[in-house]
């Protein structure tokens, strides 16, 4: 049952004498494995014997007998899928039909494959795209219906017999669908390749020529042109004539139209291969070319630069840059249309010729204010001298010059005065628009460039102003030299360094931080009374009476300043002690008597001691000694002693008389 056998392989295989053939083949026998395989050459079915007759190239049987031909022919298949064959070498007489006789346990099949073996290697086939245009990449394909593992070949590309530089990509196919070798070459043809012969050459592994195919390239391209001009250098003077001729060196397909262009713009009514320019003017200077078109597109010739020579035109001056800042660099450029270019220039500053300046550019490395003004120039070439143009204005800007701060007040200035200063300058460009003052203060500027300082401070030492346009120029600071009364006056105790004790030598000094003018006088006062006129107040032996509030005054021609009040404290031992008696020094017995120890001391008495007429100390230590009830025996002389941190003092004796009461007298 034929439906049970399915084969896949190329229908025809091609080779040449001495090469080899590789036959990719697959099959499927559904009823079981292959038991017998015979490869016939041109098999014929014999109806009588019901068998195939023909040359047996290969036989595979159960007993494994293999004919000698099997060395050349190999079955590379298996019992159920693969039926690939190889014939190596292959001969001319192998051409014809190969028959694959397959037998399984129950089925038989004859599969036929065509083999075409030529006497010599057959040529490859070059495939070209339908149209080739210049500079457009195309792929050239060289195809050979041959590939065999045992016989390596190569395909090489030649242009006009010379190997092509471009890298080709070679691919092979040995499949049940197709057997071939292919080489693909990517190539960007130029117009010059038109009509050239391209060859694909088949070579063996050693590079020996086997066969080839050739094609002629038909490269479509725009017209290729050559332009000729008379005179050949294309340099003329105004009024001369010029002829230009356009020649087509190649065009594929043929050209259709001709035109001329100047500086890229088409010239009207110029549609022939010759362009005649009569009595040229300088405006006709420029780049000329001819343009010829075909179906591919327009082609342009190279450009011819026509130079119409003329004397310089009136010149203009360009300044880099104006306004210019003083100290910066400036460049002047003389611009004049001329052909040939000017060879000599004459420069003018404010109408006066600038000596030694003959170049197109004038460079001033450091601009100064006097460089300002009008600059003009004259250009000269072989055809003549141009005219002087209107010129250009150079504006030189600079900070205000010679700025000074001027005090408007009569001198000297005193603390508290209103001071007016002005800011003056010599010149400025651009104009001064504002002023600055140092140091900054809450000061008035009644008008531009004038500063008014109300109630000037003693410590306003210097003032500087700046006049400003785009820049500020500072004046040197001006000293106000403000005069003021002495400041920070104080009393300083020079000696002793510790507390002042009565009898000490004491020195007080009147000190202050500053005074202007420096010449000063001193005054000392105590409780509003003038004590002295020296800077120092000396006490050879201080007494408690000297204690009190002291001030010193320092004056100069501007005014006087007093110190803070300074308290002079004198420490002394208790003095002027006395015993006072209350209600009096005569007291009736039974009543109350109070003795008080009065004293003058600094610091105050801290401890009292009482004594009787026998100098016997009494057990009382307070300022008051209270006797209650007083007895006649209390009569007698008493004294007290006071003690402080400085020392002791004692009182004179004070006598207390205690007399009898009427009751006591009555009892007696």
């Amino acid at each position: 049952d034929s439906s049970k056998w399915v084969f896949e392989h190329p229908e025809t295989l091609y080779a040449w004498e001495g090469a080899c053939v590789w036959i990719p083949c697959t099959y499927r026998a559904l009823d079981g494995d292959l038991e017998s395989f015979i490869l016939f050459h041109n098999p014929e079915y014999n109806k009588n014997t019901s068998k195939f007759d023909g040359t047996r190239l290969y036989e595979s049987t159960k007993d494994g007998k293999v004919p000698s031909e099997q060395k050349r022919v190999q079955f590379l298949g298996d019992k159920n899928k693969n039926c690939t064959l190889s014939i190596h070498p292959v001969h001319l007489n192998d051409s014809g039909q190969l028959g694959l006789r397959m037998e399984s346990k129950t089925e038989k099949w004859m599969e036929r494959i065509h083999l075409n073996v030529s006497e010599r290697p057959f040529p490859p086939h070059i495939q070209l795209p339908p149209e080739i245009q210049e500079s457009q990449e195309v792929t050239l394909t060289c195809l050979l219906n041959f590939s065999c593992y045992g016989y390596p070949i190569q395909l090489q590309w030649l242009l006009e017999g010379v190997p092509m530089r471009q890298a080709a990509v070679t691919s092979t196919s040995l499949t049940i669908k197709s057997v071939f070798t292919r080489s693909e070459l990517k190539f960007s043809p130029q117009w010059s390749h038109h009509g050239k012969i391209v060859t694909c050459q088949l070579q063996d592994a050693d590079g020996k020529f086997l066969s080839n195919d050739t094609v002629q390239l038909n490269v479509k391209h725009t017209p290729k042109l050559e332009i000729k001009v008379t005179p050949s250098d294309a340099i003329v003077r105004e009024g001369d004539s010029v002829t230009m001729t356009c020649e087509v060196s190649s065009s594929n397909p043929e050209y259709t139209t001709v035109s001329w262009l100047k500086d890229g713009t088409s010239l009207k009514k110029q549609n022939t291969f010759t362009l005649n320019l009569r009595e040229v003017t300088k405006d006709q200077s420029g780049k000329y070319c001819c343009q010829v078109s075909n179906d591919v597109g327009p082609g342009r010739s190279e450009e011819v630069f026509l130079q119409v020579q003329y004397a310089p035109e009136p010149s203009t001056v360009q300044i880099l840059h104006s306004p210019a800042v003083e100290g910066s660099q400036v460049e002047f450029l003389c611009m004049s249309l001329a052909n040939p270019l000017p060879t000599n220039y004459t420069w003018y500053h404010n109408g006066k010729e600038m000596q030694g300046r003959t170049e197109e550019k004038v460079h001033i490395p450091k601009i100064l204010p006097w460089h300002a003004g009008t600059y003009s120039c004259v250009a000269e070439n072989i055809l003549g001298t141009g005219q002087r143009g209107p010129g250009a204005e150079l504006d030189v800007q600079y900070p205000p010059k010679k700025v000074t701060t001027v005090i408007q007040n009569p001198m000297p200035i005193r603390e508290g005065d209103t001071v007016t200063l002005s800011c003056n300058y010599n010149s400025s460009n651009p104009s001064v628009t504002r002023y600055e003052w140092k140091p900054h203060g809450a000061w008035e500027e009644p008008s531009l460039g004038v500063l008014k300082i109300q109630n000037v401070g003693w410590d306003n030492t210097t003032i500087a102003c700046a006049a400003c346009n785009s820049w500020c120029s500072w004046a040197s600071p001006v000293a106000l030299n403000v005069q003021y009364a002495p400041r920070d006056v104080r009393v300083r105790k020079i000696k002793p360094l510790s507390e002042i004790h009565s009898g000490n030598s004491v020195s007080l000094q009147c000190d202050f931080s500053s005074s202007h003018p420096k010449e000063v006088q001193f005054f000392w006062e105590k409780n509003g009374r003038l004590l002295g006129k020296e800077s120092q107040l000396n006490f050879d032996s201080i007494s408690p009476e000297d204690a009190g509030s002291y001030s010193c005054w320092v004056n100069n021609s501007i005014g006087q300043t007093a110190s803070k009040a300074w308290t002079l404290e004198v420490l002394y031992a208790p003095r002027r002690l006395r015993v006072s008696m209350s209600p009096g020094d005569q007291v009736m017995e039974g009543k109350s008597a109070t003795l008080t120890c009065e004293s003058d001391a600094n610091p105050p008495v801290s401890h009292y001691t009482w004594f009787d007429w026998n100098n016997q100390s009494l057990p009382y230590h307070s300022q008051k000694l209270r006797l209650e009830p007083v007895k006649v025996q209390h009569s007698g002389a008493y004294w007290c002693q006071g003690t402080n941190s400085v020392g002791k003092g004692r009182s004179p004796l004070s006598t207390l008389t205690v007399y009898y009461s009427p009751e006591t007298i009555g009892r007696r």
Epitope: D488, R492, K493, Q509, F512, S513, S514, A565, W566, T567
Partner: antibody, heavy 119, light 112 residues
Framework: QVQLVQSGAEVKKPGASVKVSCKAS????????MHWVRQAPGQGLEWMGI????????SYAQKFQGRVTMTRDTSTSTVYMELSSLRSEDTAVYYC????????????WGQGTLVTVSG | EIVLTQSPLSLPVTPGEPASISCRSS???????????LDWYLQKPGQSPQLLIF???NRAPGVPDRFSGSGSGTDFTLNISRVEAEDVGVYYC?????????FGQGTKVEIK
């Protein structure tokens, strides 16, 4: 011995006033000027003003003008510093310091009073 | 007002080594009689400031002689000849020439 003893710590609300006292002992109270200095947390010393205990005259730093009042009571040898319209930045330790009559240096300092101002 | 500028603001020291602090005034503190009204104070951690040097170079009573003050006019220096551990704290200069009294920012001295 000579010493200045200040009143204790105070906590006040913003806008309130505080009155700190400084009691002098061991010397003649009226013979020496008294200054007030404050120190905000982690900051330096800042002078506030001076009072003459003898006559009661004062001089204040520009910054505190109108908010600070310094007074004295000679009977108790005490000076006072009152700061009004308190704000959080017034949180500081406030010191009284005696001015040495010879040199003008602050030879004796109080122990300080912490005033905290918080909402 | 007079502005006092101290430097450095922080001073790490090694015990036994010398140390110095600078104080610069915005105007001269020298008086008519030649006194420089600049004082130095030390504020130890958690304590009130204490007087070290008065009128530029005079040591206050009880201050060790390793402390000394020098300078005149606008530039003053406090020197510690050999730093001891108890000298740590913040040192301030103050001008006593005029009211308002002004202080430097303070220099923090700490042991390395």
């Amino acid at each position: 011995q000579v010493q200045l003893v200040q009143s204790g710590a105070e906590v006040k609300k913003p806008g309130a006033s505080v009155k700190v006292s400084c009691k002098a002992s061991g010397y003649t109270f009226t013979s020496y000027y008294m200054h007030w200095v404050r120190q905000a947390p982690g900051q330096g010393l800042e002078w506030m003003g001076i009072i003459n205990p003898s006559g009661g005259s004062t001089s204040y730093a520009q910054k505190f003008q109108g908010r600070v009042t310094m007074t004295r009571d000679t009977s108790t040898s005490t000076v006072y510093m009152e700061l009004s319209s308190l704000r959080s930045e017034d949180t500081a330790v406030y010191y009284c310091a005696r001015e040495d009559s010879g040199s003008g240096a602050f030879d004796i300092w109080g122990q300080g009073t912490l005033v905290t101002v918080s909402g | 007002e007079i502005v006092l500028t101290q430097s450095p603001l922080s001073l790490p020291v090694t015990p036994g080594e010398p140390a110095s602090i600078s104080c610069r005034s915005s105007r001269s503190l020298l008086s008519y009689h030649g006194y420089n009204y600049l004082d130095w104070y030390l504020q130890k951690p958690g304590q009130s400031p204490q007087l070290l040097i008065f009128v530029g170079s005079n040591r206050a009573p009880g201050v060790p002689d390793r402390f000394s003050g020098s300078g005149s006019g606008t530039d003053f220096t406090l020197n510690i000849s050999r730093v001891e551990a108890e000298d740590v704290g913040v040192y301030y200069c103050m001008q006593s020439l005029q009211t308002p009294r002004t202080f430097g920012q303070g220099t923090k001295v700490e042991i390395k």
